[in-house]
């Protein structure tokens, strides 16, 4: 029996009965927040073999092992993950071992096992046999291995029953509990699963099977399940669903899930039954079950009930996220805000068409309208009094409308009005008239030449760069000395720079009047010697990174009510030199024979250039005699210290915190202070833990149902 669409068992352990007949959980399984310790021995769900999404266990008192509950759980597919994880075991106070001895495959996602104060048998499981990549696993804050005394079956009797593998250079027996080995298939099976008797399963099986080489005897399917058979692809007239089975069109048409209730139903696209058309596609008609490619960004029509949508905060802009056509009028009134330009671009940047008018007034936080980066048509079907469809009034810091070199905007009907925009040059307004096709519509008073641009340097000269020099983390640039008609009007220069992977930035990107600016700014004083060209050394830059740089002359903005000339450069793109890459990440080595080592790693996080090759060095190490001092098979010889409390925020203080044994004849020596990199890594680690914990709490704590 398939159970779904996700099972949440909380508060009452008797809810576990809901799992009674489930063989596959199509969705997630949550078992959490059961605070009263119960006896779980009478609960056993041998039918459950597959969870298609993830398994989450959190604060279940009294549960000591998962092996009795789910003795045959074989595959967790991870089709959807919980914060990148397919298996999460968090703050399980009484869990002593995981014990999922039939778990053979986690198809996608990693595992997170954290803050389980009594949990052992973690180092005895070879997760690389279950997951493709173990580098993202997070196993922290559980019972320390040296306090566990994990013994695999038969070890005490010196008749070990389990197989050995190498993890982190340690060749050891692999098991789930004191009496359950970790199953490994013969090497002859390759990537295939195997039966309990080590016979190879059919290639389409995943995890295990009840009979060899039989695609109807699989416990789970590598690809898709259809009518009792594991198939590499869904047969004709059936469609992939939830990443694991094939369904017909009728099933897909009838799905009504809590997640998709607002949509127009599931669609069939590229052989899959899915909740929505994928990115770049749209339904072929409102009630169609099929998708067609969008021409450009996919259209999303948004309508305002009250006809006019007032954007006075990020929250109100948020309502327009993803909208490409806005049916109604936009009134923009942004007086203040934090990081407002990029937030507005995030939420309004896809709007292409406004059917009514656009009015921008008292928006002192705005420097530019470039956040409406895709606006191409104002229809003016509804206009303001006086027949205005674009109205810009009293915006104290507005300097740019759009970058007219890269913008086509048409105003189909209605006039434009501009007044009391002291930093907006009239030339910018005239340019808009030409681009939008409104030239000749405006009457004389519609564009006020006195109070627009009165506090701006409107006639700009161009500053030219004269030289650029780069190193791995520095750029030196110089430019022609600017000479305004009256040298006293020139105060200084400001250099603006930022990382620019692509050559598509504009001066006003991410800039608002409330201090947010995606550009770094450096002031440069005039050189005292009039023959020396001004310049700057930009340092602390990243190697092999393209930067955008431009320079502005800082001038007195008004001389007896005459507009004066300003000056700025074009945007220059310049790349720093390459440098030594950071160290390769996640280096893992394992031995697959007596004369071979397999070494794997991930690329460095900072390549600092184009990587061309890696150098691998190795050397023989003497065997550590310390390994032979204890008989680790004798349980009573393992020193059991204090009970682990499952917290990881406080570092454990050892007996002598001041010293550590350095080996050799050196004797005790001081612990090395942590490097800045180590401190930073610790800080990031703590931050990551908090983020995950917040995500967990936000996901699982929900209002009690009626």
């Amino acid at each position: 029996e398939i159970c779904g669409p996700g099972i949440d068992i909380r508060n009452d352990y008797q809810q576990l009965k809901r799992l009674e007949n489930c063989t596959v959980i199509e969705g997630y399984l949550h078992i959490l927040l059961i605070s009263k310790a119960e006896d779980y021995r009478s609960y056993r769900f041998p039918k459950l073999t597959v969870i298609t999404e993830y398994l989450l266990l959190f604060r279940v008192a009294g549960l000591e092992s998962l092996g009795d509950l789910f003795p045959n759980l074989t595959v967790i597919r991870g089709w959807k993950l919980f914060y990148n994880y397919a298996l999460v075991i968090f703050e399980m106070t009484n869990l002593k071992d995981i014990g999922l001895y039939n778990l053979r495959n986690i198809t996608r996602g990693a595992i997170r096992i954290e803050k389980n104060a009594d949990l052992c048998y973690l180092s005895t499981v070879d997760w690389s046999l279950i997951l493709d990549a173990v580098s993202n696993n997070y196993i922290v804050g559980n019972k320390p291995p040296k306090e566990c005394g994990d013994l695999c079956p038969g070890t005490m009797e010196e008749k070990p029953m389990c197989e050995k593998t190498t993890i982190n250079n340690e060749y050891n027996y692999r098991c789930w509990t004191t009496n359950r080995c970790q199953k490994m298939c013969p090497s002859t099976c390759g990537k295939r699963a195997c039966t309990e008797n080590n016979e190879c399963c059919h290639p389409e099986c995943l995890g295990s099977c009840s009979a060899p080489d039989n695609d109807t005897a699989c416990v789970a399917c590598r690809h898709y399940y259809y009518a009792g058979v594991c198939v590499p692809a869904c047969p004709p007239n059936t469609y992939r669903f939830e990443g694991w089975r094939c369904v017909d069109r009728d099933f897909c048409a009838n799905i009504l899930s809590a997640e998709s209730s607002d949509s127009e139903g599931f669609v069939i696209h590229d052989g899959e039954c899915m909740q929505e058309c994928p990115s770049g596609f749209i339904r072929n008609g409102s009630q169609s079950m099929y998708c067609i490619p969008c021409e450009g960004p996919c259209p999303k029509v948004c309508e305002e009930e009250k006809k006019t949508k007032t954007i006075d905060s990020v929250t109100s802009a948020q309502m327009l996220q993803g909208c490409t056509i806005f049916k109604g009028n936009l009134l923009i009134n942004i007086r203040r805000g934090n990081n407002i330009a990029s937030e507005l671009e995030n939420f309004m940047g896809l709007i292409e068409v406004v059917t009514g008018y656009v009015k921008i007034r008292h928006s002192h936080a705005l420097v530019s309208l470039s956040f409406l980066k895709n606006l191409r048509l104002i229809l003016g079907e509804e206009q303001l009094e006086g027949n205005y469809s674009f109205y810009v009034l009293d915006n104290q810091n507005l300097q740019q409308l759009w970058d007219w070199d890269h913008r086509n905007l048409t105003i189909k009907a209605g006039k434009m009005y501009f007044a009391f925009n002291p930093k907006l040059c009239v030339s910018e307004i005239y340019r808009m008239e030409e681009v939008t096709g409104t030239k000749g519509r405006q009457s004389k008073g519609d564009i006020n030449t006195r109070n627009n641009g009165e506090r701006a340097s409107c006639e700009s000269d161009v500053l030219h760069f004269t030289s650029t020099t780069t190193s791995k983390n520095r750029i030196i640039i110089t430019w022609h000395r600017y000479r305004p008609p009256d040298y006293r009007d020139l105060i200084s220069f400001t250099v603006y720079y930022k990382e620019a992977p692509f050559k598509n930035v504009t001066e006003y990107d991410g800039q608002d009047a409330c201090g947010s600016n995606s550009w770094n700014m450096v002031d440069v004083d005039l050189p005292p010697n009039k023959d020396v060209e001004p310049g700057i050394l930009l340092h602390g830059l990243k190697p092999w990174t393209q930067y955008a740089v431009y320079v502005k002359a800082v001038t007195l903005t008004m001389v007896e009510n005459d507009h004066i000339r300003g000056a700025k450069s074009e945007i220059l793109y310049i790349r720093t030199n390459a440098s030594v890459p950071s160290i390769p990440l996640d280096v893992l080595s394992a031995s697959n024979s007596s004369s071979q080592l397999i070494v794997k790693w991930n690329p460095p996080s900072l390549p600092n250039g184009n990587l061309s090759y890696y150098i691998v060095r190795w050397q023989r190490q003497p065997q550590d005699g310390y390994l032979y001092r204890h008989n680790y098979c004798s349980k009573d010889k393992i020193p059991i210290r204090k009970y682990a409390d499952g917290t990881i925020d406080i570092e454990e203080v050892t007996e002598n915190p001041k010293t550590e044994v350095c080996g050799g004849e050196k004797g005790p020596c001081c612990a090395c202070p942590k490097t800045e990199a180590e401190k930073q890594a610790e800080k990031e680690e703590a931050e990551y833990r908090k983020v995950f914990e917040n995500f967990l709490h936000n996901s699982i704590f929900v209002p009690r149902p009626e």
């Epitope: 029996e1 398939i2 159970c3 779904g4 669409p5 996700g6 099972i7 949440d8 007949n21 489930c22 969705g27 009728d250 099933f251 048409a253 009838n254 799905i255 009504l256 899930s257 809590a258 997640e259 998709s260 209730s261 127009e264 139903g265 409102s286 009630q287 149902p705 009626e706």
Partner: antibody, heavy 117, light 112 residues
Amino acid sequence: QVQLQESGPGLVKPSETLSLTCTVSGYSITGGYLWNWIRQPPGKGLEWIGYISYDGTNNYKPSLKDRVTISRDTSKNQFSLKLSSVTAADTAVYYCARYGRVFFDYWGQGTLVTVSS
Amino acid sequence: DIVMTQSPLSLPVTPGEPASISCRSSQSIVHSNGNTHLQWYLQKPGQSPQLLIYKVSNRLYGVPDRFSGSGSGTDFTLKISRVEAEDVGVYYCFQGSHVPWTFGQGTKVEIK
């Protein structure tokens, strides 16, 4: 794989309240779909009574609205029908059924409720 | 309420011969989203109803192709091209476009 099973008393006295429960296995009633009650008097046609949706909202047949309540117990994955002030005309086979976007896809096997003193 | 009227109420048929059932609604059953939620169900003796056709003409996967649905607005038809013995039972039309949802009174198909 989804199964619905009606349960409740087979005999109810006139003017009392008829109470039936539908136990769902294989699908969580909060996960989606509309969970319906339909009845069929002996030898007659089908009559839709009402539903409770995955989010707990209800819709009832107007002529029964004053007497009917459909509720749910999410912890047991069950939904229930209560029909008050019953008369002999309420004698019927009562079915629970799941409705998606476009059709009823799963039905219970039905339970006969007789209203008689 | 929308009244669904089926005709005939009884339909004796000869195996191999065609059969046709009409269903008329008292008002249009086109949903606001443009869909027409008209379904046909068959209830065999002693069983729960089973779906044959949804959205007027979509035959459910696995239903024999001798069953077909047609119609629009207020007039709908279920056709069986060649009746077989296993097709006996009561056929109901159903509208799910407007609440309250309503069934037709049913058409009993029996072998002559």
